[in-house]
């Protein structure tokens, strides 16, 4: 069976939107009006992995681009990157571990925990226009809570 996917945008809990910053990086900033069209649309795929009521394994691709968020070790540190893939083979039900995030729903907010690096989360900075990154702390200065907005296909 083909993998189930939906199109969406994400905003952090401070209402910052995610936009492309160069070919392989996302940044978070406040957008208004027509500028909202700059925000990236994700194709969120529901993939194989350990699942519970509030935790669902997903992969986050960029809609109509052969790019996926992935988590790898760089210089001994878990790092978030945008990785290019062969569009003929992705998305797929059994994604490589670096592409898998546990989508965790808490109080109508979403967290995206790396399946490869437990307790590391997709994060944004309080500051404007800073890269989206993989953070190893929750509840500190950095933001790990998001809301999801559905986008029609």
């Amino acid at each position: 069976a083909p993998v189930r996917s939906l199109n969406c945008t994400l905003r952090d809990s401070q209402q910052k939107s995610l936009v492309m910053s160069g070919p392989y990086e996302l940044k978070a900033l406040h957008l208004q009006g027509q500028d909202m069209e700059q925000q990236v649309v994700f194709s969120m795929s529901f993939v194989q992995g350990e699942e519970s009521n509030d935790k669902i394994p997903v992969a986050l691709g960029l809609k109509e681009k052969n790019l996926y968020l992935s988590c790898v070790l760089k210089d001994d540190k878990p790092t978030l990157q945008l990785e290019s893939v062969d569009p003929k083979n992705y998305p797929k039900k059994k994604m490589e571990k670096r592409f898998v995030f546990n989508k965790i729903e808490i109080n109508n907010k979403l967290e995206f925990e790396s399946a490869q690096f437990p307790n590391w989360y997709i994060s944004t900075s309080q500051a404007e226009n800073m890269p989206v990154f993989l953070g190893g702390t929750k509840g500190g200065q950095d933001i790990t809570d998001f809301t999801m907005q559905f986008v029609s296909s």
Epitope: E50, V72, L73, S84, V85, K94, E96, K97, Q116, F117
Partner: antibody, heavy 120, light 107 residues
Framework: QVTLKESGPGILKPSQTLSLTCSFS??????????VGWIRQPSGKGLEWLAH???????SYNPSLKTQLTISKDTSRNQVFLKITSVDTVDTATYFC????????????WGQGTLVTVSS | DIQMTQTTSSLSASLGDRVTISCRAS??????LSWYQQKPDGTVKLLIY???KLHSGVPSRFSGSGSGTDYSLTISNLEQEDIATYFC?????????FGGGTKLEIK
């Protein structure tokens, strides 16, 4: 010091089920990011990745053999198992287990291998 | 599946030579490539990971390079103990696949 050691039946007949055990020391399969894979090598030929299991129980299989393969682990006993059903003579090979940490995989430590012969 | 091709199945060189072994992927593998040495007794060791990073304990005469689909392993000053078969492995996409191997012999 990390060591891995494979054990198996040595010889078995076509259509039987091959059961392999990888016993390891020097690391724990409960450690986040840890994985163990199985790789085989027919005599005089190249290496073929078969299956892999992660610390969290997530499994991956080579699709060319997927219906025949089952990988499992006993974390407390430091063992990983591979079952191959309905073996044939083409499954005659040396079977290795190897350890990696994180994806993408680099197999950092390898066992010495165990030779399995399938013959009627 | 991603095919990994080591075009040279065997290679003969003299002690002290600089030897290069190549590996080609059927598609871009994002530098997710590692190299392994298999000694005649069957023992397998990791040499290089992530294209060019030297695994701990591996002599510095071994080096790796490449990008996209083309990768290589270089031994800068061949020693007797380097007589072995060398395999590449791609970790970009499941199923993980090995090259067919290059057997290195002494002239």
């Amino acid at each position: 010091q990390v060591t891995l050691k494979e054990s198996g039946p040595g010889i078995l007949k076509p259509s039987q089920t091959l059961s392999l055990t990888c016993s390891f020391s020097g690391f724990s399969l409960s450690t986040s990011g840890m994985g163990v894979g199985w790789i085989r090598q027919p005599s005089g030929k190249g290496l073929e990745w078969l299956a892999h299991i992660w610390w969290d129980g997530d499994e991956s299989y080579n699709p060319s053999l997927k219906t025949q393969l089952t990988i499992s682990k006993d974390t407390s006993r430091n063992q990983v198992f591979l079952k191959i059903t309905s073996v044939d003579t083409v499954d005659t090979a040396t079977y290795f287990c190897a350890r990696n940490r994180y994806d993408p995989p680099w197999f950092v430590d390898w066992g010495q291998g165990t030779l399995v012969t399938v013959s009627s | 599946d991603i095919q990994m091709t080591q075009t040279t199945s065997s290679l003969s060189a003299s002690l002290g030579d600089r030897v290069t072994i190549s590996c080609r992927a059927s598609q871009d593998i994002s530098n997710y490539l590692s190299w392994y040495q298999q000694k005649p007794d069957g023992t397998v060791k990791l040499l290089i990971y992530y294209t060019s990073k030297l695994h701990s304990g591996v002599p510095s005469r071994f080096s790796g390079s490449g990008s996209g689909t083309d990768y290589s392993l270089t031994i800068s000053n061949l020693e007797q103990e380097d007589i072995a078969t060398y395999f590449c492995l791609q970790g970009k996409m499941l199923p993980w696949t090995f090259g067919g191997g290059t057997k290195l012999e002494i002239k």
